[in-house]
Interface confidence: low
């Protein structure tokens, strides 16, 4: 599923991401834009053999199990395939764990490079939330 900007903002808000661990909703929508272009089925292979999955490109080295990543920790205790669902519940719950793990949203390279320090509220402007 490819979400619309406001559609994703509403879904993320419904799942409790607005101001979760201090990060406003715009940060999450911005991260999803530059990680996956709002596509829940996005996958990208990394040079270390791990893969990033889903709308927030969650990595199989640490957070989920795809059965092919050596030394995977699977800290979210989920199959990586769950992160590709059109239902973003699994991605959101795992993201909550990631953002709470000490580095905040710096865990997402795209957020660091494209969203951090910018007017992220622009990503939810005009949305009925």
């Amino acid at each position: 599923k490819v979400f619309g900007r406001c559609e994703l903002a509403a879904a993320m808000k419904r799942h409790g991401l607005d101001n979760y661990r201090g990060y406003s909703l715009g940060n999450w929508v911005c991260a999803a834009k530059f990680e996956s272009n709002f596509n829940t089925q996005a996958t990208n292979r990394n040079t270390d053999g791990s893969t990033d999955y889903g709308i927030l490109q969650i990595n199989s080295r640490w957070w989920c199990n795809d059965g092919r990543t050596p030394g995977s920790r699977n800290l979210c205790n989920i199959p990586c395939s769950a992160l590709l669902s059109s239902d973003i519940t699994a991605s959101v719950n795992c993201a909550k764990k990631i953002v709470s793990d000490g580095n905040g949203m710096n865990a997402w390279v795209a957020w660091r490079n494209r969203c951090k320090g910018t007017d992220v509220q622009a990503w939810i402007r005009g949305c009925r939330l």
Epitope: G16, L75, N77, I78, N93, K97, I98, D101, G102
Partner: nanobody
Amino acid sequence: EVQLLESGGGLVQPGGSLRLSCAASGFRISDEDMGWVRQAPGKGLEWVSYIDNNGYSTYYADSVKGRFTISRDNSKNTLYLQMNSLRAEDTAVYYCAKKQYGYQNGGFDYWGQGTLVTVSS
């Protein structure tokens, strides 16, 4: 402010059952890994069980597997521990706790005040 309030402890005969409850406030338990830890008289803390925030996984210490069941009711913001086939060695103060994020074997960062379970005939 995070608060955890346990209830449901008491005296029960061997082979009996109890259900412990933990009412949480100051946060949503659906966002957290939540667990139960116990301390038997004169002994150290023993991890009993926890439930992952994503709802996929529950974990149990070997000593309680098959007898205890952890669950939660997100609408009531309450965690439960159903304890069946209780044994004398289950006698302890049981603490509800919020698990630290990120690491499966990490510790707990918030605790309740505990509820005493005594298994005796």
